[in-house]
């Protein structure tokens, strides 16, 4: 292993998964590396194998239990270590003392569906996945709509500052194909970040009614 600047970032999905990315400037040649999780007040520990995602970064998911089980709470502190094999020994490459509920990134919203569509309007709903009951209603959402001839990056962001799992899109163009995405973020946590965007939902507005000939 070659030494270099190292960055180790992890997020908790609020239930039973900690996802980690480790990047190192100096390339690691044919080295086996893992993330080890050691909670301060629990009897279990967990390991995952780091797999390359680019030339100098590796990722893995610590699966702590069944997807909807509440494996950690706000009082837990988990020491996360990157360990790389060096001959017969393991070398600690990075360490993070991790407060799960200060480092949240939820799963992307799922089950997007068109509830009702008109010529200029579309009502869309979705569900959140594997989100802790601790949040109650303390979640916010961002949504975006892809219009013809534009990119996702150009799409204006619509902010829903409450746990509202639906949206009514207005001022749409009749008989036009659109795509829609949504993401979620808990209000809690100093280092909490947005979930990934949902899978896009494609929909088409209804054509305008034809005017009568006189």
């Amino acid at each position: 292993a070659v030494n270099g600047t190292s960055q180790f970032t992890c997020f908790y999905n609020s239930r039973a998964n900690i996802s980690c990315v480790w990047s190192q400037d100096g390339a690691l040649q044919d080295t086996s590396c893992q993330v080890h999780a050691w909670p301060d007040r629990r009897r279990w520990n967990q390991t995952c194998e780091l797999l390359p995602v680019s030339q100098a970064s590796w990722a893995c998911n610590l699966i702590l239990g069944a997807p909807d089980s509440q494996k950690l709470t706000t009082v837990d502190i988990v020491t996360l270590r990157v360990l790389c094999r060096e001959g017969v020994r393991w070398r600690v490459m990075a360490i993070q003392d991790f407060k799960p509920f200060e480092n949240l990134r939820l799963m992307a919203p799922i089950s997007l569906q068109v509830v009702h569509v008109e010529t200029h309007r579309c009502n869309i709903s979705w569900e959140i996945s594997q989100a802790s009951h601790y949040f109650e209603r303390h979640l916010e959402f961002e949504a975006r709509t892809l219009s013809p001839g534009h990119t996702w990056e150009e799409a204006p962001l619509l902010t829903l500052k409450q746990k509202q799992e639906w949206i009514c899109l207005e001022t749409l163009t009749p008989d036009t194909q659109y795509e829609f995405q949504v993401r979620v973020k808990p209000l809690q946590g100093e280092f909490t970040t947005w979930s990934p965007w949902s899978q896009p939902l494609a929909f088409r507005t209804k054509p305008a009614a034809l005017g009568k000939d006189t």
Epitope: N3, S6, R81, E86, R91, V92, M93, I95, Q96, D97
Partner: nanobody, 120 residues
């Protein structure tokens, strides 16, 4: 060889303040996480706070907003400023240093502890 020596403990009334220090020697150029733990009589040792080489801090919920961890790299010293002390903060406080990164920078080291007594 890494050595850690705590100081600054003592007796104080509830609501008072103390500042603990932990002087570190050996392997001072290594990346490390430095932590404070505490152990009350008849209880398990518990995490209090930590600070990483990149200055990122973590606190146990029971001390957040009352305790502040810091370090002076020039003096190789770790500090724990403890304000608004409560009777339940009574414990022996231990400093810990965990080295990482280079192959010669590995290992976990503990100090001998310093006693903090808070009377109500």
């Amino acid at each position: 060889q890494v050595q850690l020596q705590e100081s600054g403990g003592g007796s104080v009334q509830a609501g008072g303040s103390l500042r603990l220090s932990c002087a570190a020697s050996g392997s001072t150029s290594c990346s490390s996480v430095m932590r404070w733990y505490r152990q009350a009589p008849g209880k398990e040792r518990e995490f209090v706070s930590s600070i990483n080489s990149d200055r990122r801090t973590v606190y146990a919920d029971s001390v957040k907003g009352r305790f502040t961890i810091s370090q002076d790299n020039a003096k190789s010293t770790l500090y724990l400023q403890m304000n608004s002390l409560k009777a339940e903060d009574t414990a022996t406080y231990y400093c810990q240093r965990e080295l990482y990164g280079d192959s010669w920078c590995q290992g976990n080291y503990w100090g001998q502890g310093t006693q903090v007594t808070v009377s109500s």
